[in-house]
């Protein structure tokens, strides 16, 4: 059982554990999300992503979650259960990112560019909100990310 993001294979990640970690904090996160009209991982970000694009897109999205979302939220929360859940998610995201090596070849430029444009839509939506609201919404949308990642899961 592994993820196949196009040519990028990821082993050793158990999706069940990601879901368990997310569900442990889901109600808290989504209850704190007051901006229900906006969505960060909108349709245009995740819809019809090709296998070739998926490696670039998941790499940039997970890196953003690690460097911006988890890092900043970790400094704002004190509840042990919440910290434990975020640690589980972050550790697994690190494991995924460490195995992703998107090709930097010139012939992949258009695919890389397409994935980057999708990521920019997400980042723009994130930056339009104030920091606290953006972090809360991003964490509350981890289920959208996990659901999309299932498309690249292999039994």
């Amino acid at each position: 059982q592994e993820f196949h993001f196009g040519p990028c294979q990821v082993k050793g990640v158990v999706p069940q554990k990601l879901w368990e970690a997310f569900w442990a904090v889901k109600d808290t996160m989504q209850a704190q999300d007051n901006i229900t009209s906006a969505r960060l991982l909108q349709q245009e970000v995740l819809q019809n992503v090709s296998d070739a694009e998926s490696c670039y897109l998941v790499h940039t999205l997970l890196e953003f979650y690690l460097k911006t979302v988890f890092k900043n939220y970790h400094n704002r929360t004190v509840e042990v259960r919440t910290l434990k859940s975020f640690s589980t998610l972050a550790n697994n995201f690190v494991l995924i990112v460490s195995q992703l090596q998107p090709s930097q070849e010139n012939e992949m430029f258009s695919i890389r560019d397409s994935a980057h444009r999708r990521f920019l839509l997400f980042r723009r939506a994130f930056k339009q909100l104030d920091v606290e609201a953006a972090l809360t919404k991003a964490l509350g949308e981890v289920d959208i990310l996990l659901t999309w990642m299932q498309k690249f899961y292999k039994l």
């Epitope: 069940q16 879901w19 368990e20 889901k26 349709q43 819809q47 659901t147 999309w148 292999k154």
Partner: antibody, heavy 119, light 106 residues
Framework: QLQLVESGGALVQPGGSLRLSCAAS????????MSWVRQAPGKGLEWVSH????????FYAESMKGRATISRDNAKNTLYLQMNSLKSEDTAVYYC????????????WGQGTQVTVSS | SYELTQSPSVSVALKQTAKITCGGD??????AQWYQQKPGQAPVLVIY???RRPSGIPERFSGSNSGNTATLTISGAQAEDEADYYC?????????FGGGTHLTVL
Amino acid sequence: QLQLVESGGALVQPGGSLRLSCAASGFTFDDYAMSWVRQAPGKGLEWVSHISGNGFSTFYAESMKGRATISRDNAKNTLYLQMNSLKSEDTAVYYCAKDDYGSGLYAYWGQGTQVTVSS
Amino acid sequence: SYELTQSPSVSVALKQTAKITCGGDNIGSKSAQWYQQKPGQAPVLVIYADSRRPSGIPERFSGSNSGNTATLTISGAQAEDEADYYCQVWDSSAAVFGGGTHLTVL
């Protein structure tokens, strides 16, 4: 050999209760979320309930909220569904299913157990 | 709550191609599964993650998912493919099944 064996189905009167069991073998039970899915006579599949591998997270279909409780005993490799205040529309074959992703990827199903609610 | 729409029945001539569709709002952003069920038997997973085939499922079964429609395609339908087919996705902490499509192989 992976196996899911349901039991506990019976004929029960409206308003009655029933506890279904699903004995699992051939895989590391607590690593996987599990679900109950039912099928009324001549009808389609209807998801009933879901429980995470650690048992901490549970979800229910609207039709069963407040009347059903899903649980698991990971030491016994067994999944349960406690159903109360049963109605005639709960008559169905109840299947347990192993979730291979944690959010509805049912690669393995039991053979089902018949629940009939009638006076 | 999320809904999936399937046409109740589809007919196909033996060895021809059958297409069974499943409609849902923005289903393309979700992972779609397809199950085959024969009378008196438990469902069997035939397609998962939109287009992947579990081991043991014949190559004639394929799937796609885009926009508001997921599609199960059976290329060169065989008599043993006559069954009910259900699409399924996960949405907001719930599994959702389509109403099912009965495939008749003529």
